[in-house]
């Protein structure tokens, strides 16, 4: 039997240009986490495998960033953006638990920023 | 195996600067973040910043920002922490651990750092 | 900030004991807390992640709980090699906190 819950960011806005933090919380299970993948719609963004590490979907490598833990990091937001992410955790023996998360990119000041980083 | 080698110590100047290295084998190092964890003396662990080798991606905690630089040489798979102006509260062991699915799965073995004349 | 506050500060037990060691958040971290044990001279080992995520390796007596500010790290049935340094620290957001630590001593 399925016992984990999935706590999600939820709703959340970021500005456009910003940067947004991406997360999601699987508890109540004892289940072990063997990856963790978050996508756009259809489109794998990136993954964090248990022997593997962070792989980071070529076409998003330039505005993606793994972290802070199993959560990902979305810079330079463009309107385009707008939609919804999909955290799936696959555990063992549990199976797949997913979660889910609606971001809108705005154009006003308005809007929560994320993470800061320096690329070198 | 995975395996994170740091030099057992390193004794330099005041004032002076010195590069710590950590070398990754065993896994894909462009693949888990690496993290920079100081240990004064008998006391508590302090995090110092992390780098994703496969960007280059850094954050740092702030009381850190203007001590330590990190890099890393991918064709080595070795990690760096560059530390200025040294003082004698710099003193101490520097670990360096890799995070990847299950957080802060393996740590190099440290290195002491000593800074006086 | 995340300041990880971690109590007591010093335990002293006996081998055979059980003892519940606490972690507290100035906020929530739902459940991005990690436990750590130091033996003296030694570098940390990861013993649970993700709050109660236990790890290849490490004995089934040690049991985390909790979410969102307050964790517990449980040790059932204390060994002599379960003496030391016990740390917790937080991957929920930059920068990563760790806990002061609680010392495990035989009594």
């Known amino acids: 039997m399925m016992t984990g819950t999935i706590e999600t960011t939820g709703n959340i806005s970021a500005e456009k240009g910003g940067s947004i933090i991406l997360q999601c919380h699987l508890s109540s299970t004892t289940a072990q986490v063997t990856q963790v993948n978050w996508e756009q719609q259809d489109q794998l963004l990136a993954i964090c495998n248990a022997d593997l590490g962070w792989h980071i979907s070529p076409s998003f490598k330039d505005r993606v960033a793994p972290g802070p833990g199993l959560g990902l990091t979305l810079q330079s937001l463009t309107v385009n953006d707008t939609g919804e992410y999909f955290c799936i955790y696959h555990t063992y023996p549990d199976g797949t638990y997913t979660g889910r998360i609606f971001l809108e990119v705005l154009e006003s000041s308005v809007a929560e920023h994320g993470a800061r980083f320096q690329i070198p | 195996q995975v395996q994170l080698q740091q030099p057992g110590s390193e004794l330099v100047r005041p004032g002076a600067s010195v590069k710590l290295s950590c070398k990754a084998s065993?896994?894909?190092?462009?693949?888990?973040?690496m993290h920079w964890v100081k240990q004064r003396h008998g006391q508590g662990l302090e995090w110092i910043g992390n780098?994703?080798?496969?960007?280059?991606?850094?954050n740092y905690d702030e009381k850190f920002k203007n001590k330590g630089t990190l890099t890393v040489d991918t064709s080595s798979s070795t990690a760096y922490m560059h530390l200025s102006s040294l003082t004698s509260e710099d003193s101490a062991v520097y670990y360096c651990?890799?995070?990847?699915?299950?957080?802060?799965?393996?740590w190099g073995q440290g290195t002491t750092l000593t800074v006086s004349s | 900030d995340i300041v990880l506050t971690q109590s007591p500060a010093t335990l002293s037990v006996t081998p055979g004991d059980s003892v519940s060691l606490s972690c507290r958040a100035s906020?929530?971290?739902?459940?991005?807390l990690h436990w750590f044990q130091q033996k003296s001279h030694e570098s940390p080992r990861l013993l649970i992640n993700y709050a109660s995520q236990s790890i290849s390796g490490i004995p089934s007596r040690f049991r985390g709980s909790g979410s969102g500010t307050d964790f517990t790290l449980i040790i059932n049935s204390l060994e002599t090699e379960d003496f030391g340094m016990y740390f917790c620290?937080?991957?929920?957001?930059?920068?990563?906190?760790f806990g002061g630590g609680t010392k495990l001593e035989i009594k």
């Open positions: 065993g896994y894909t190092f462009t693949s888990y973040w």
């Open positions: 906020q929530s971290i739902r459940n991005s």
């Open positions: 651990a890799r995070e990847g699915l299950y957080a802060f799965d393996y």
């Open positions: 620290q937080q991957s929920n957001s930059w920068p990563y906190t």
């Open positions: 780098i994703f080798p496969g960007s280059g991606i850094t």
